[in-house]
């Protein structure tokens, strides 16, 4: 069912913002819920259309918001309307001038059919006027001017719904914007009457929730649910099931709540007046204040919850003590059950004293026939029966009845059975990409025969002439990728589509056969690549032993990174090495290696090496000297790839001395990149060169770098910025 | 529509190399495994090479083997074909073909290839 | 490698009769066999698949048939669109992806 609720803030227009919110609580709503001006019950108001825009702080909402300066074109008979599978239900709702000549008693006023009716307007302005009565637009009623009293009344002796409507009040000269508004709702039936013929007795509707002449069903005020409206909300929630909040600092004040007809409109519980700003006086409590607390025992009177009963006690003046009959009441049975064909076990779970038995329960089909359970069991709180079909069809679908008849009453609930064929895809999956050892497979979920919607997927799969189960895999997306498949192996592939609910595995649908790629070997072991020469590089691997008979060779192919060049070579099987020649000196190469038979196997990771130099290395760069302390320093560099560097070497001397007074310190290890210098003299002054070696000789410094260590006693000194880590 | 169209092919020399494009569209290229098919003038339909569709396998004919090289360009939905050291005998409508269940379901329209001295 | 050979070369046949052409592997190809047209100066065109499967779009005068090593194509009522060559393809066992040497089917 809907529940729709219109928020009116603030029915009477000052110079304040004021809005329309029409919530769609706890439904989802097929059609866009609409706000538009209710012309049927004021015809003569303002045309222009409204701006409706989403209510940003809730999904289901809409919100029309007028500013200050629109204060002239607001009065007037406003509707919310939600649409679900065709029905409409429609709340509405009025706004007028709080410097009105008159002002309503009440926005709403709901009365039953045949009730002694006055409708009142309090005078809020003296004129020296007739005062007119219309409704829905039409003159009914005027007093003369001398005549006009402080509660202006419409007296209904005998009311009828054809007297409901919008009644408004004004003085001759005013318009529509001096005008009261107040609605009449008029319920079809009389009082605690409904049903088609009003032959119905209502349920006792607490919290002055109204009865509903159509259903029978309470509709809680704002602040009050179930089905009494006996059970209080939390603070400042509402709705059929409380999930609702006022957002305000002081909860639902200033909130005027709209409910469908026959509700009307009313403040939240708590709150009273026409703009639902006035809290409840003590021992009040309720939608408008309405409700007296009169607790028993001395229990508390909370202005939103009515009496707060101490543990034990219950009933809205808590006066009711220990384990009374109840009424049985079939719990956690959902309206609509959507049932996989084969076999069905629906249960019927209700509560109530004395708990239901057995035989007191019972499963009523469409076509009439009666089931009783064929197991039963219950706990504290609740029977529970469980029922047998063994094999329901699609043409069992239709409303079921759970009945429970027992002492305390008798309770029976509809529910919708939907039964869907399981699902089975009409074509076989698609093989769109395999190797030897994987296979892409599109599943071809859709089209499929049966009912949606799919729940999850199975794609099985077996080798063929193998004896083994099919193994399964759930797949997410249409295309899945299988791993770890055999080599030159014929395999069967099917889909099984599983919708929601038990049961809901469909068959699995069409088989396709495909066959894996004969396999390549796997790459040569070992493999290293190194330098030979300017021009060559040589790369070897372990020797191969195949487990087959076929013919095989080594596939190397090689790749400049610079250049675009790309040579693969055909190696004998039997060889362990293979020289790349008429290579570019000082050039870096990208190797990698397989091993084919019929088949190709399957490439080694890319090996990566550089051809010697052909010309001297460039010096270390960005060399830095940095710690130094009395008989220490750290020098660092960096040197350039592609040179074939092979060593560098750190020469220093005191300076002054003798050419061949140097130290050499030859670092062999190219990737060295820092070095600590020890065993220097303190307070002494050192030059230092720093060159690179590679096959053709080496670097040539352009200039000395200087190293004055420190004396003994000081900190260590830094002179080439940055942080070295040795 | 899935649509396959070739180029690159040329007139050239026995021992030089050439390379073949087939631009993809229509279909999620990335995913499909992709093959060359080749047919000399007057003959019938032989397969060339496949390449998989994230690259990673690759196959080849034993005729080709070793002088030709499948790759693809997944970003640019292009497939290629590299053709070094071409022989007379590979002279033919080169064909780009999308692989379904093994079997190729589209075609292209070919490209001519003559190795000719 | 899987040899498959199609015969006859040539098959002559009047628009509106019946064709049948043959396919025969030198192994087993269980039912990895596919059909395709071919007319001149265009590329082929799938057929059948699987050995029987019509793909999408074709007419079903054409139907395939066969298993194991013994396949057939069948053109219940020749068109006049229909003459071209006829190439059957096995995928069972690669690599390599082999076809026929095809099937010439012209107006008699």
């Known amino acids: 069912a809907m529940d729709l609720i219109l928020i009116n803030s603030l029915p009477l227009v000052s110079d304040a913002e004021t809005s329309l919110t029409c919530i769609a609580s706890g439904w989802r709503p097929h059609e866009p819920i609409t706000i538009g001006r209710d012309f049927e019950a004021l015809m003569n108001q303002h045309q222009d259309p409204l701006e409706v825009t989403q209510d940003v702080t809730r999904e289901w909402a809409k919100k029309v918001v007028w500013k200050r300066e629109k204060a002239s074109k607001i009065n007037g008979a406003y509707f919310c309307e939600g649409r679900v599978r065709g029905e409409a239900i429609r709340i509405r709702t009025m706004k007028m001038r709080q410097q009105a000549s008159f002002l309503p008693a009440t926005l709403t006023m709901t009365v039953d059919k045949g009730d002694n009716v006055n409708i009142s307007f309090k005078k809020v302005l003296i004129k020296e006027e007739d005062a007119v009565i219309y409704k829905n637009g039409s003159f009914i009623h005027s007093v003369p001017r001398h005549e006009v009293p402080d509660i202006l009344e419409v007296h209904l002796p005998h009311a009828q719904p054809q007297d409901a409507g919008v009644y408004s009040a004004r003085y001759i000269g005013g318009n529509l914007f001096t005008s009261a508004f107040t609605r009449l709702i008029v319920r079809r039936c009389e009082a605690q009457k409904w049903g088609p013929e009003c032959n119905h007795l209502c349920t006792a509707c607490m919290n002055n929730g109204v009865c509903h002449e159509d259903t029978g069903e309470c509709i809680c005020p704002p602040g009050f649910m179930g089905r009494t409206c006996e059970k209080a909300c939390e603070l400042h929630t509402f709705g059929r099931t409380c999930k609702e909040r006022c957002s305000g600092q002081e909860g639902c004040k200033s909130y005027v709540f709209c409910l469908p007809d026959p509700y009307g409109c009313s403040c939240a519980t708590g709150w009273k007046g026409l703009q639902c700003n006035e809290a409840c006086h003590p021992g009040f409590y309720g939608p408008d204040c309405k409700l007296r607390c009169s607790c028993n025992n001395g229990e508390m009177c909370d202005r939103f919850q009515g009496c707060l009963c101490s543990p034990g006690w219950q009933g809205l003046q808590c006066e009711r003590e220990g384990i009374q009959r109840m009424t049985p009441k079939i719990v956690d049975l959902p309206d609509h059950i959507e049932v996989n064909s084969g076999k069905f076990n629906p249960i019927c779970k209700a509560s109530g004293w004395p708990l239901p038995t057995n035989e007191e329960m019972t499963l009523v089909k469409p076509d009439g026939t009666v089931l009783h359970p064929k197991d039963f069991n219950h706990t504290d709180h609740f029977s529970v029966a469980i029922f047998t079909i063994h094999r329901i069809l699609p043409p069992d679908s239709g409303v079921w009845v759970c009945s429970v008849n027992t002492v305390a009453g008798m309770v029976e609930k509809p529910f919708n059975i939907s039964v869907k064929v399981l699902p089975k895809p009409l074509n076989a999956p698609n093989v769109i990409d395999t190797g030897h050892n994987f296979a892409v497979i599109n599943i071809s979920s859709e089209p499929y025969f049966g009912d949606g919607p799919i729940k999850s997927k199975k794609l099985l799969y077996k080798p063929v002439n193998h004896y083994e189960a099919w193994q399964h895999i759930q797949v997410t997306n249409e295309i899945v990728t299988l791993n770890y498949l055999e080599p030159r192996t014929e395999y069967e592939l099917c889909v099984q589509l599983v919708r929601r609910g038990e049961g809901g595995e469909g068959h699995p649908g069409p088989v396709r056969r495909f066959t894996t790629a004969s396999i390549g070997l796997p790459p040569p072991r070992g493999l290293n690549l190194l330098p030979k020469s300017q021009t060559t590089l040589n790369l070897t691997w372990q020797p191969i032993f195949p487990s087959s008979e076929d013919d095989f060779y080594v596939e190397v192919e090689r790749r400049s990174v610079q250049k675009s060049d790309q040579q693969n070579i055909k190696v004998p099987g039997n060889l362990t090495s293979v020289l790349l020649n008429n290579l570019h000196p000082r050039e870096q190469y990208v190797v990698r290696a397989r091993v084919n038979t019929k088949a190709q196997g399957e490439w080694s990771e890319d090996l990566t090496a550089w051809t010697l130099s052909d010309i001297l290395p460039p010096q270390p760069e960005n060399i830095k000297i940095s710690n130094i302390t009395h008989s220490s320093a750290v020098i660092s560099w960096t040197i350039l790839d592609g040179y074939s560097i092979s060593s560098i070497t750190i020469r220093y001397k005191v300076q002054g001395k003798n050419e061949d007074q140097h130290v050499d310190v030859k670092i062999k290890n190219a990737t060295i990149t820092q070095y600590q210098l020890k065993g220097l003299e303190p307070e002494t002054a050192y030059q230092v060169d720093i060159f690179a070696e590679n096959n053709i000789g080496s670097s040539n410094p352009a200039f000395s770098h200087e190293l004055v260590t420190l004396p003994e006693s000081q900190a260590p000194a830094d002179l080439g910025g940055g942080k070295m880590l040795l | 529509d899935v649509q396959l169209v070739e180029s690159g092919g040329a007139v050239v020399r026995p021992g030089e190399s050439l390379r073949l494009s087939c631009a993809a569209s229509?279909?999620?290229?990335?995913?499909?495994?992709m093959n060359w098919v080749r047919q000399a003038p007057g003959k019938g339909l032989e397969w060339v090479s496949r390449?998989?569709?994230?690259?990673?396998?690759?196959f080849y004919s034993e005729s080709v083997k070793g002088r030709f090289t499948i790759s693809r360009d997944n970003s640019k939905s292009t497939l290629y074909l590299q053709m070094n050291s071409l022989r007379a005998e590979d002279t033919a409508i080169y064909y780009c073909?999308?692989?379904?269940?093994?079997?190729?379901?589209?075609w292209g329209l070919g490209t001519l290839v003559t190795v000719s001295s | 490698e899987i040899v498959l050979t199609q015969s006859p070369g040539t098959l002559s046949v009047s628009p509106g009769e019946r064709a049948t052409l043959s396919c025969r592997a030198s192994?087993?190809?269980?039912?990895?066999l596919a059909w395709y047209q071919q007319k001149p100066g265009q590329a082929p065109r799938l057929l059948i698949y699987?050995?029987?499967n019509r793909a999408t779009g074709i007419p079903d005068r054409f139907s395939g048939s066969g298993s194991g090593t013994d396949f057939s194509l069948t053109i219940s009522r020749l068109e006049p669109e229909d003459f071209a060559v006829y190439y059957c393809?096995?995928?069972?066992?690669?690599?390599?992806?082999?076809f026929g040497g095809g099937t010439k089917v012209e107006i008699k």
């Open positions: 390449i998989s569709g994230n690259g990673g396998s690759t």
């Open positions: 192994q087993h190809v269980g039912g990895n």
């Open positions: 393809q096995q995928y069972y066992d690669w690599p390599p992806l082999t």
């Open positions: 229509g279909f999620s290229f990335d995913i499909y495994g």
């Open positions: 699987d050995a029987s």
């Open positions: 073909a999308r692989t379904l269940n093994n079997f190729f379901d589209y």
